[in-house]
C-alpha cells in the first residue's frame, strides 16, 4: 500500500533497514556507523552546492523474535515485517537501504508497491536481476557469469591460447551468502554461464572434488569454487593435484591478497584467485581500519548507498524537481557518482560495475601477481602479466579437456 | 600475524638427543604448516622439518630418520625431535609459520652439538 515519504520541505530521510538476517556478520553498529560517516560526507556536499537542507536516517530493527537464524535463511519475512513496521509508523523515507539478502529483497520488491528506490548492499542472485528501482551496491552474480563467459571464451593472450568450453564447479552447500548465488547462478541450467559451456557438473561432496583432483577420467580440468586459501586448504589439504588442473577461487570480497607482507602458501600454485580491485585508499582508510578484509567491502556498500542518495538528492534539487515521483525511483542507475574512495559506475540496472582481477601465485616469489584485469562495465578483459610465472607447463593455462589440441 | 617462541636448545654431545619446542600465540591448527629452519655460521639458513595443519610431513635429506617433527594442539606448540645428532647439526634454530597468509618468525634458539 501507498506509505507517505517523510521526503519533502527541506527535510530528507533515509530509511535504513537494520535487519537480522544479512548476507555478512557485520555488528549492526559498524553498519551504523558506515550510514553516520556517509551522512555527515552528504551533508557536507549538499552545503557545498549551496543545498540548505536536512538529510538524516531512520534505523529500523526487527525484533530479531521470530527471524533469528542470522543468515540469509529466515530473511524472507523479516523483511516484510519491517516494511509492515514502517507502514504503520508513517515513517517511510525518500529511498530505503537495507534488504542485503536475495530472498527478502526479492520479496519485497514483489510484494511492494515501489513507488521509492532500493539501495541493497547485497542481493547476489540472478531473481534480483533486472529490477527497476532496485540498486546493487556490491557486485551481483550476473557480473561474475560474464567475466567467466569472457574468460573462458579467450584464446589471444599469451598465457591462454586455448578457448575453453567445461567446467567443474564444487558447491557443498555451506557457503557464504554471496557465494551461494554466485555458485547457484553457475548451476542454474538456463543462466548465460550454462548456456555458453559445452559440459559442466556440479560436484556437492569434498569426495567428488577430491577424486577430481587426480582422475585421469575427469571431463574437464577447470575447477570453480567460491570462498578463500583457507576455505580450499581445507577441502583439498596436501592431496596431489594433476599439473593441468586449474583450480578458480572466487573470492571477490576479500582485500588481503593485496596487503603486504601476504605470500601464497604451496597450495595456492593451481590457482586463479578471482577478486575485486580493493579501493585507492580503503586498505589504510580510518573508516576501514576496524573492519576485517572480507566485511570492508559490506560496510563500504552502505556507506556509498548513503553518497548515492545524496548524488541523487542534488541533481533533483538542482533542478528543481520532486523527490516523491517515479522518476526519482527509477532514477538510481545509468551513472556514475563519487563514491567514499572514487567514483563508483552504475550500469542500466543499477547493477554496480567493478573491475574483477585475477590472481596467480608466481612460482618465483610465491607472491600473488595480477594476471589480468576485467571491467564488468564494458565486459571486456585486459592482460596485465603478459609472461606470468605459472606453475603450469610452458606458463600457459592448459587446455580444459586434457588431450585436445589446440583449437 | 602470529608470535612464535623457541626453546629447548643448548649444548649436546654427539648422538645425544635434544627436543627443540615452538609456541605459538595462536591456535597452530589454523596455521597451514609450521617449519623447522636452521641457519649454521656463514651458511644459508635451510629447511629442516615441516608439519602441514593436514598432517602431512616432510624432512631435508640431511636428517631423515633422525629428526621428527610433531604437534600438540592442545598446547599450540610444535616439537622437533633431535635424536643422533652430529656437529653438523651446528646452528641456530628458527622456527616458522604460515598462516595461510603470512610468514612469522621465531627469534631462534642456539643448538651447540661438540664433545
Known amino acids: 500500500s501507498q506509505v507517505s515519504q517523510n521526503c519533502h520541505n527541506g527535510s530528507y530521510e533515509i530509511s535504513v533497514l537494520m535487519m537480522g538476517n544479512s548476507a555478512f556478520a557485520e555488528p549492526l553498529k559498524n553498519l551504523e556507523d558506515a550510514v553516520n560517516e556517509g551522512l555527515e560526507i552528504v551533508r557536507g556536499r549538499l552545503q557545498n552546492a549551496g543545498l540548505n537542507v536536512t538529510v538524516n536516517a531512520t534505523f529500523m530493527y526487527s525484533d530479531g523474535l521470530i527471524h533469528n537464524s542470522g543468515d540469509c535463511r529466515s530473511s524472507t519475512c523479516e523483511g516484510l515485517d519491517l516494511l509492515r513496521k514502517i507502514s504503520n509508523a508513517q515513517r517511510m523515507g525518500c529511498v530505503l537501504i537495507g534488504p542485503s539478502c536475495t530472498y527478502s529483497t526479492f520479496q519485497m520488491y514483489l510484494d511492494t508497491e515501489l513507488s521509492y528506490p532500493m539501495i541493497s548492499a547485497g542481493s547476489f542472485g540472478l531473481s534480483c536481476d533486472y529490477k527497476e528501482t532496485l540498486t546493487r551496491l556490491m557486485s551481483p552474480a550476473r557480473k561474475l557469469m560474464y567475466f567467466l563467459v569472457n574468460f573462458w571464451k579467450t584464446n589471444d593472450l599469451p598465457f591462454k591460447t586455448y578457448s575453453w568450453s567445461t567446467s567443474y564447479v564444487y558447491k557443498n552447500g555451506t557457503e557464504t551468502e554471496d557465494c551461494f548465488w554466485y555458485l547457484n547462478a553457475l548451476e542454474a541450467s538456463v543462466s548465460y554461464f550454462s548456456h555458453e559451456l559445452g559440459f559442466k557438473v556440479v560436484l556437492r561432496q569434498d569426495k567428488e572434488f577430491q577424486d577430481i583432483l587426480m582422475d585421469h577420467n575427469r571431463k574437464s580440468n577447470v575447477i570453480i569454487m567460491c570462498g578463500g586459501p583457507e576455505f580450499l586448504y581445507k577441502l583439498k589439504g596436501d592431496r596431489a593435484v594433476a599439473e593441468d588442473i586449474v583450480i578458480i577461487l572466487v573470492d571477490l570480497f576479500n582485500d588481503q591478497y593485496f596487503e603486504d607482507n601476504v605470500t601464497a602458501p604451496d597450495y595456492m600454485k593451481n590457482v586463479l584467485v578471482l577478486t575485486l580491485s580493493p579501493g585507492n585508499s580503503l586498505l589504510n582508510s580510518s573508516f576501514s581500519r576496524n573492519l576485517s578484509p572480507t566485511k570492508r567491502d559490506f560496510a563500504l556498500a552502505y556507506l556509498n548507498g548513503i553518497l548515492l542518495f545524496g548524488h541523487m538528492l542534488k541533481i533533483f534539487l538542482e533542478n528543481g524537481e520532486n523527490i516523491t515521483t517515479p522518476k526519482f525511483a527509477h532514477a538510481f542507475r545509468n551513472l556514475t557518482f563519487e563514491g567514499y574512495d572514487g567514483p563508483v559506475t552504475l550500469d542500466d540496472w543499477g547493477d554496480v560495475d567493478s573491475t574483477m582481477v585475477l590472481l596467480y601465485t608466481s612460482v618465483d616469489t610465491k607472491k600473488y601477481k595480477v594476471l589480468l584485469t576485467y571491467d564488468t562495465h564494458v565486459n571486456k578483459t585486459y592482460p596485465v602479466d603478459m609472461s606470468p610465472t605459472f606453475t603450469w607447463k610452458n606458463s600457459k593455462l592448459p587446455n580444459d579437456i586434457t588431450g585436445r589440441g589446440p583449437q | 600475524q602470529v608470535q612464535l617462541v623457541e626453546s629447548g636448545g643448548g649444548w649436546v654431545h654427539p648422538g645425544g638427543s635434544l627436543r627443540l619446542s615452538c609456541a605459538a600465540s595462536?591456535?597452530?591448527?589454523?596455521?597451514?604448516?609450521v617449519d623447522w629452519y636452521r641457519q649454521a655460521p656463514g651458511k644459508q639458513r635451510e629447511l629442516v622439518a615441516g608439519i602441514t595443519s593436514g598432517g602431512t610431513t616432510s624432512y631435508a635429506d640431511a636428517v631423515k630418520g633422525r629428526f621428527t617433527i610433531s604437534t600438540d594442539n592442545v598446547k599450540d606448540t610444535v616439537y622437533l625431535q633431535m635424536n643422533s645428532v652430529t656437529p653438523e647439526d651446528t646452528a641456530v634454530y628458527y622456527c616458522h609459520a604460515h598462516d595461510h597468509w603470512r610468514d612469522s618468525w621465531g627469534q631462534g634458539t642456539q643448538v651447540t652439538v661438540s664433545s
Open positions: 595462536r591456535n597452530i591448527f589454523s596455521m597451514y604448516r
